[in-house]
């Protein structure tokens, strides 16, 4: 390595380019400066993302993949660096950018929201799971009436265009449904969604957004909820939701509502059963909901509550109609 009294001048990388390699994905590439003397030192590169969101990182190789929204444009810089116990040196920056795509901002969609849901694949002999995707949006305030929007998603290396749209009264696409996708429900990749558009009257600005699966995955409610009363013991059991996550990956909430006095008990659990001490004069309705535990994935959404189950004394039964 460089000694404290040695001097080396660092030169910026050359041929720095940004290539769009997929939906919301770019490849940054550069070459070492051919005039850079190496002198047995460990040179690295510092990549700085300037826009749309500031970030930086180091790498020893001459390319870098970046997952990022592109509808606001994209700008990055790279420089050669040398950092050790007695040196801190950096070259000037080499920079490149992608301009924002054409079309005024008001023509692009707004309020894009997406949710995923898991179903069991009944066509397969092995237990496997399918992930559906549903997205909705609002038409841009400056979009001409003849605007038509088109949605695409990318997950990993898979990109698909929507085939099933819902439309507004003017026939413009405002929602999309993929019954089956290439999304892996236990995956940790970003889900990239792009909505572009066309109009005879003006350019329509595309809009892309990145979603973390844990934040949009609508967990199914627990299955086969049962409740029994033995004396003053209310025993509740259930099965894990339809999900690619295994049994140990769920947190549960049990809601016990005493319909006689209105008292509501909510318990948070990590097991598939719960016993509560109750009075045997009341009627109860019981519901359970689930969420993927933070042991298995970042905190996300709770499922809907399961359908209520009614147990207990039913003195005030409505008269049965004959």
């Amino acid at each position: 390595d460089l000694l404290p009294d040695e001097k080396i001048s660092l030169l910026p990388p050359v041929n720095f380019t940004i290539k769009v390699t997929g939906l919301a994905q770019v490849l940054l590439q550069w070459k070492p400066n051919p005039d850079q003397e190496q002198r047995n030192v460990n040179l690295e590169y510092q990549v700085k993302i300037n826009a749309p969101k500031e970030d930086d990182y180091e790498t020893r190789i001459t390319e870098s993949k970046c997952v990022t929204i592109l509808h606001k444009g994209f700008s990055a810089s790279v420089r050669t660096i040398l950092q050790n116990d007695h040196s801190l040196l950096a070259s000037s920056w080499a920079s490149a950018e992608l301009h924002a795509p054409p079309g005024s901002p008001g023509t692009s969609i707004v309020n894009l929201t997406c949710t995923t849901n898991t179903t069991e694949d009944n066509y397969s002999r092995l237990r496997s799971y399918q992930v559906s995707l549903h997205c909705t949006w609002l038409v841009g305030t400056d979009a001409p009436e003849d605007t038509q929007y088109f949605l695409y998603y990318r997950y990993g290396s898979w990109t698909e265009e929507c085939q099933e749209y819902s439309k507004d009264t003017l026939g413009r696409n405002i929602a999309c449904w993929f019954p089956r996708t290439f999304i892996l429900s236990k995956g940790r990749d970003w889900l990239a969604v792009l909505v572009n558009g066309s109009s005879k009257h003006s350019a329509i600005r595309p809009f892309d957004q990145l979603f973390a699966l844990h934040a949009i995955d609508q967990i199914n409610p627990p299955l086969n909820v049962t409740a029994e009363i033995e004396g003053t013991r209310l025993s509740i059991q259930w099965e894990k939701p339809v999900s690619a996550f295994p049994i140990h990956c769920f947190d549960y909430e049990v809601k016990i509502h005493n319909t006689r006095n209105g008292y509501l008990q909510i318990e948070k659990l990590m097991t598939n059963a719960f016993i509560s001490i109750i009075d045997d004069l009341s009627k109860y309705d019981v519901q359970v909901r689930a969420a993927v535990s933070s042991m298995c994935r970042e905190a996300g959404l709770w499922s809907e509550w399961s359908q209520p189950i009614y147990v207990g004394n039913d003195e005030h039964k409505p008269l049965r109609e004959w």
Epitope: Q46, K48, K53, E54, D55, D56, Y57, E58, I81, Q83, H86, S87, L88, L89, A90, A212, E298
Partner: antibody, heavy 118, light 107 residues
Framework: EVQLQQSGAELVKPGASVNLSCTAS????????MHWVKQRPEQGLEWIGR????????KSDPKFQAKATIAADTSSNTAYLQLSSLTSEDTAVYYC???????????WGQGTTLTVSS | QIVLTQSPAIMSASPGEKVTMTCSAS?????MHWYQQKSGTSPKRWIY???KLASGVPARFSGSGSGTSYSLTISSMEAEDAATYYC??????????FGGGTKLEIK
């Protein structure tokens, strides 16, 4: 050797202003981001803000925007923190810190103790 | 702003004991960084980008985590490890925030 040398301790009256300095040796500050961090007695660390000395761009915690002004002079390789309208709440050790990266702090000065007292 | 909560606030360990301290973020962060500070001295960069050891940091230290949950572990406590450890996150929208610190004492 890479070093950050901060100015000496300050005792100032409430309502006054103070200018703290941090001079780098062993590197050019224009190659780095220079940050200022506050530590009140027996307390944790609070980020005040940063400057990119190459272009003068600054970013700071909104909480300190009315209180602190960060500047840099690349010719003297020095970063500055100016604190105004001082109160006893500003009594603290102020560290200058910086490095090549935005995300974290490679090098730290020895700290400047500021005491605000009448 | 992202709030970092360190636990425990104070802990003590015997020489040779394994030590783990945690840092919990109020929302997801990409990386966590850790600093060691001994009384009356400046903080030192200790672990950066979640798991990389700064120059000169003994190999008994390690860092791990993702999302909202991060930790610093010492595989075998030594007397020189007694210090306060701060976690720190960076997000592209200021501010940078630190945890409240974990003070590690030797038994």
């Amino acid at each position: 050797e890479v070093q950050l040398q901060q100015s000496g301790a300050e005792l100032v009256k409430p309502g006054a202003s103070v200018n703290l300095s941090c001079t780098a040796s062993g590197f050019n500050i224009k190659d780095t981001y220079m940050h200022w961090v506050k530590q009140r007695p027996e307390q944790g660390l609070e980020w005040i803000g940063r400057i990119d000395p190459a272009n003068g761009n600054t970013k700071s915690d909104p909480k300190f925007q009315a209180k602190a002004t960060i500047a840099a002079d690349t010719s003297s390789n020095t970063a500055y923190l100016q604190l105004s309208s001082l109160t006893s709440e500003d009594t603290a050790v102020y560290y200058c810190t910086g490095g090549l990266r935005l995300r974290f702090f490679d090098y730290w000065g020895q700290g400047t103790t500021l005491t605000v007292s009448s | 702003q992202i709030v970092l909560t360190q636990s425990p606030a104070i802990m003590s360990a015997s020489p040779g004991e394994k030590v783990t301290m945690t840092c919990s973020a109020s929302s997801s962060v990409s990386y966590m960084h850790w600093y060691q500070q001994k009384s009356g001295t400046s903080p030192k960069r200790w672990i950066y980008d979640t798991s990389k050891l700064a120059s000169g940091v003994p190999a008994r230290f390690s860092g791990s985590g993702s999302g909202t949950s991060y930790s610093l572990t010492i595989s075998s406590m030594e007397a020189e490890d007694a210090a306060t450890y701060y976690c720190q996150q960076w997000s592209s929208n200021p501010p940078i925030t630190f945890g409240g610190g974990t003070k590690l004492e030797i038994k």
